[in-house]
Amino acid sequence: YNNFRKSMDSIGKKQYQVQHGSCSYTFLLPEMDNCRSSSSPYVSNAVQRDAPLEYDDSVQRLQVLENIMENNTQWLMKLENYIQDNMKKEMVEIQQNAVQNQTAVMIEIGTNLLNQTAEQTRKLTDVEAQVLNQTTRLELQLLEHSLSTNKLEKQILDQTSEINKLQDKNSFLEKKVLAMEDKHIIQLQSIKEEKDQLQVLVSKQNSIIEELEKKIVTATVNNSVLQKQQHDLMETVNNLLTMMSTSNSAKDPTVAKEEQISFRDCAEVFKSGHTTNGIYTLTFPNSTEEIKAYCDMEAGGGGWTIIQRREDGSVDFQRTWKEYKVGFGNPSGEYWLGNEFVSQLTNQQRYVLKIHLKDWEGNEAYSLYEHFYLSSEELNYRIHLKGLTGTAGKISSISQPGNDFSTKDGDNDKCICKCSQMLTGGWWFDACGPSNLNGMYYPQRQNTNKFNGIKWYYWKGSGYSLKATTMMIRPADF
């Protein structure tokens, strides 16, 4: 049987070799131009994919397929012409030079070639069918794309008009959000930065305090001299008063010595019939020393002695131990009554403490302690509190058990830092604790994220500085 094989020659042309008996026939065929080789990544069944193609990709693939078809058609035409030419020449030669049986071989070869041509044509028909199939698919996809594009365009137009409507609303809200985000970032930075600064401040102020301590020693010496002079003056005044009263009664024995009326607290003032709010003179227990205090004769039944008030930032509360001891400020405005007087008063009988607070949004709250007293100066005016009720937090914002009082020049807190210097003002600092009603007075719009403001943690949190505060005391049995 004839041996028929296909191979490639050295220059890449396809050659068909036919072995018939002792004779061998080789046909060199022309190569298709611009046609994909079998090693090309192109796979015929790729045109059968069902997944929708991108529009541009589909167009590109169609162009490739069209080029292939065109090349195949040209190649077939060349092949047919070539075969016909070669067949004519070969047939003439065979007729002239060969015997009858060689003709049969040539006919067989021709038949084979024609079969091959038919096979190629069939393959091309398949490809053409695939291309048509894909073209139809693509046309359907394009139609679908067109419809969905129209729908999308309509939706986009609707949405655009909707967006335009919302943009005005959004711009305002965006500004708010951006402002808040900025503030949040800034606040986080500022907390860290303030911490660093406080450390620097603490070290600076340590040296200042050392200087002040030296000055205090000098001042104490001067103070003792003044106290002696004051004592001498008091004795002289008392002697004069005695002499005057003696001379008066000697002149008119019928005039009785007028009994002086003195009040220990505002409850006594109230009970004596003075029921109007205002400044009254109070007398230290077991002493003739006097102090001016504001009495609230209206709130909660009256009789309240105001021991602290903050309302407008007009008074500086970053004061010394001595100033907090004797009191400072103006009783009709911002003031501190004085730790010594409050200590003496609250150790005579049982007192309640009411703390009234106002925020910058118009809200008010209070904390009421059913038992309150301060220890003596020897024990750093330590605060003692029991029985909390009220609306300014279920937990006490004054740390329990009570702490010693601390000022910028008297550090008695439980922190390695100096809370009074850091947070400003004298207070019963813990380390440093959840409250400080004697902190920096920050105005509205600047009262948030302030670590050293007027703080009552369990009502407004740590960074909120209050608008107004009042601390007031009254006998428990009033």
């Epitope: 402002a179 808040m180 970032i185 800034i186 930065e193 303030e194 105005p443 719009r445 600047q446 994220n449």
Partner: antibody, heavy 121, light 106 residues
Framework: QVQLVQSGAEVTKPGASVKVSCKAS????????MYWVRQAPGQGLEWMGW????????NYAQKFQGRVTMTRDTSISTAYMELSRLRSDDSPVYYC??????????????WGQGTLVTVSS | EIVMTQSPATLSVSPGDRATLSCRAS??????FAWYQQKPGQAPRLLIY???TRATGIPARFSGSGSGTEFTLTISSLQSEDFAVYYC????????FGQGTKVEFK
């Protein structure tokens, strides 16, 4: 866009009062606090106070307490600053400025063109 | 009152140069700090707030830094339109401005 347009220049006598207006546009007037700042010729800037256009609440610098009054008319998005008992040193340019902050104080992001007040006998 | 001190009072520079302006607060103002630019006959214009955030529309050549008490405004490459007076402001505790730094042609 945001704009703050102030009233024109004023000439007044010592002891009199002056009222400067500031019309806002391009944003929600009641959402931002309005501040008043003044500047003497060749000098720095001095804060006078602010008004909350939403509530009408005010906060004045201690220096101007008792002499300055800030008001607003939300129907025409306008803020006013009135300074009374004028002295010769009250003759700078007065600016209105919007505070960028919503919940808390921020910088002044938009300013009016300024109103020159001349106090002369 | 927090006092803001600017330095130098006048800064003489050439276009394209780098300019550094300083401002010191008498007490900590955290990052509640801003820089403004003012040209003759005009209102001030916000440049930087929060100590380092550029305001809308401000070119990248303007940058701010610092916190607490020390602040700096840097103009990386001065343009002709940058010659003006610059003010610092704190809005931490009430509102106060510096006395200004004039940036002029060298």
């Amino acid at each position: 866009q945001v704009q703050l347009v102030q009233s024109g220049a004023e000439v007044t006598k010592p002891g009199a009062s002056v009222k400067v207006s500031c019309k806002a546009s391009g944003y929600t007037f009641t959402a931002y606090h309005m501040y008043w700042v003044r500047q003497a010729p060749g000098q720095g800037l001095e804060w006078m106070g602010w008004i909350n256009p939403n509530s009408g609440g005010t906060n004045y610098a201690q220096k101007f307490q008792g002499r300055v009054t800030m008001t607003r008319d939300t129907s025409i998005s306008t803020a006013y600053m009135e300074l009374s008992r004028l002295r010769s040193d009250d003759s700078p340019v007065y600016y209105c400025a919007r505070d960028q902050g919503i919940a808390a104080a921020g910088p002044f992001d938009y300013w009016g063109q300024g109103t020159l007040v001349t106090v002369s006998s | 009152e927090i006092v803001m001190t600017q330095s130098p009072a006048t800064l003489s520079v050439s276009p394209g140069d780098r300019a550094t302006l300083s401002c010191r607060a008498s007490q900590s103002v955290s990052s509640n700090f801003a820089w403004y630019q003012q040209k003759p006959g005009q209102a001030p214009r916000l440049l930087i707030y929060g100590s380092s955030t550029r305001a809308t529309g401000i070119p990248a050549r303007f940058s701010g830094s610092g916190s607490g008490t020390e602040f700096t405004l840097t103009i990386s490459s001065l343009q002709s339109e940058d010659f003006a007076v610059y003010y610092c402001q704190q809005y931490h505790y009430w509102w106060t401005f510096g006395q200004g730094t004039k940036v002029e042609f060298k």
